[in-house]
């Protein structure tokens, strides 16, 4: 049976917590990703940014989970208008920012 949206978001939050907690070496070798606008369509925008990071096992589960939240197919090199133009940040910072934002969405009952 399908997982309730609240459970899926809780699991995504906990996965991001695990990533930040277990970070010993620079996450994804310090790879840079496009910063995104966190105000709308956050799941697809986050996936569009993170999908361009390859060969980083630490975020593979996050990429899969974000894919479950995004209603359309996302492929590498694809960017929506939600990207913050010409601003790149490290994956580690991206994950931290995304985590805080998702915790706020959970509090507000915005599960999908």
């Amino acid at each position: 049976s399908p997982v309730p949206p609240s459970t899926a978001l809780k699991e995504l939050i906990e996965e991001l917590v695990n990533i930040t907690q277990n970070q010993k070496a620079p996450l994804c070798n310090g790879s840079m990703v496009w910063s995104i606008n966190l105000t709308a369509g956050v799941y697809c925008a986050a996936l569009e940014s993170l999908i361009n990071v390859s060969g980083c096992s630490a975020i593979e589960k996050t990429q899969r989970m974000l894919n479950g939240f995004c209603p359309h197919k996302v492929s590498a090199g694809q960017f929506s208008s939600l990207r913050v133009r010409d601003t790149k940040i490290e994956v580690a910072q991206f994950v931290k920012d995304l985590l805080v934002h998702l915790k706020k969405l959970f509090r507000e009952g915005q599960f999908n």
């Epitope: 809780k10 906990e14 930040t20 907690q21 805080v100 915790k103 509090r107 507000e108 009952g109 915005q110």
Partner: antibody, heavy 122, light 108 residues
Framework: QMQLVESGGGVVQPGRSLTLSCAAS????????MHWVRQAPGKGLEWVGV????????HYADSVKGRFTITRDNSKNTLNLQMNSLRVEDTAVYYC???????????????WGQGTMVTVSS | SYILTQPPSVSVAPGQTATITCGGN??????VHWYQQKPGQAPVLVIY???DRPSRIPERFSGSNIGNTATLTISDVEEGDEADYYC???????????FGGGTKLTVL
Amino acid sequence: QMQLVESGGGVVQPGRSLTLSCAASGFEFRTYGMHWVRQAPGKGLEWVGVIWDDGSNTHYADSVKGRFTITRDNSKNTLNLQMNSLRVEDTAVYYCARAPQWYLTAEAFDLWGQGTMVTVSS
Amino acid sequence: SYILTQPPSVSVAPGQTATITCGGNLIGAKLVHWYQQKPGQAPVLVIYDDSDRPSRIPERFSGSNIGNTATLTISDVEEGDEADYYCQVWDYSSDHMVFGGGTKLTVL
């Protein structure tokens, strides 16, 4: 300015009842979740309970559940804490505090009253 | 129910940095708030939502929340920072607000 003022504290015998009030002013009371927090002498903060902005929901700490009741009157900007079957361990300063209301009440308390002392003693 | 663990006391010299921790199981998945309380006064919010600071709070106050530990950091500590500090979270599983036991910050 924005203010919360508690009243109704005093000395009461174990087993008796007491009602505390919290008068709000300077902000739109009906849009905030309201909490009660207490602090026993020399001890830390203990959450007592919360009532949602529209009064539709309440949650209580296990230590007071079934004995304490939180109500509010949004037309009068007042919050009440009805305390029954009081125990010696309920002795504390009682604070009311506001928190912006979301779907879940995980918001910070951005405004506190100055507190009212309740002493339960025989 | 959910438990938050704080050190009972932290001491620091003026001008140094004070670090106050708040431990809880997977606390990184929760939004953490911090309060300062001086003797005889009501608590005051100093950090909310892990790391946000109310406008009236100096930039010397900052917060972080990773894994099982949330941290309140006060840089360039002043005598006026001497107070009790409490962390707080909402526990979704029990619908309870939870406070840590508090940490007394002493400025030497």
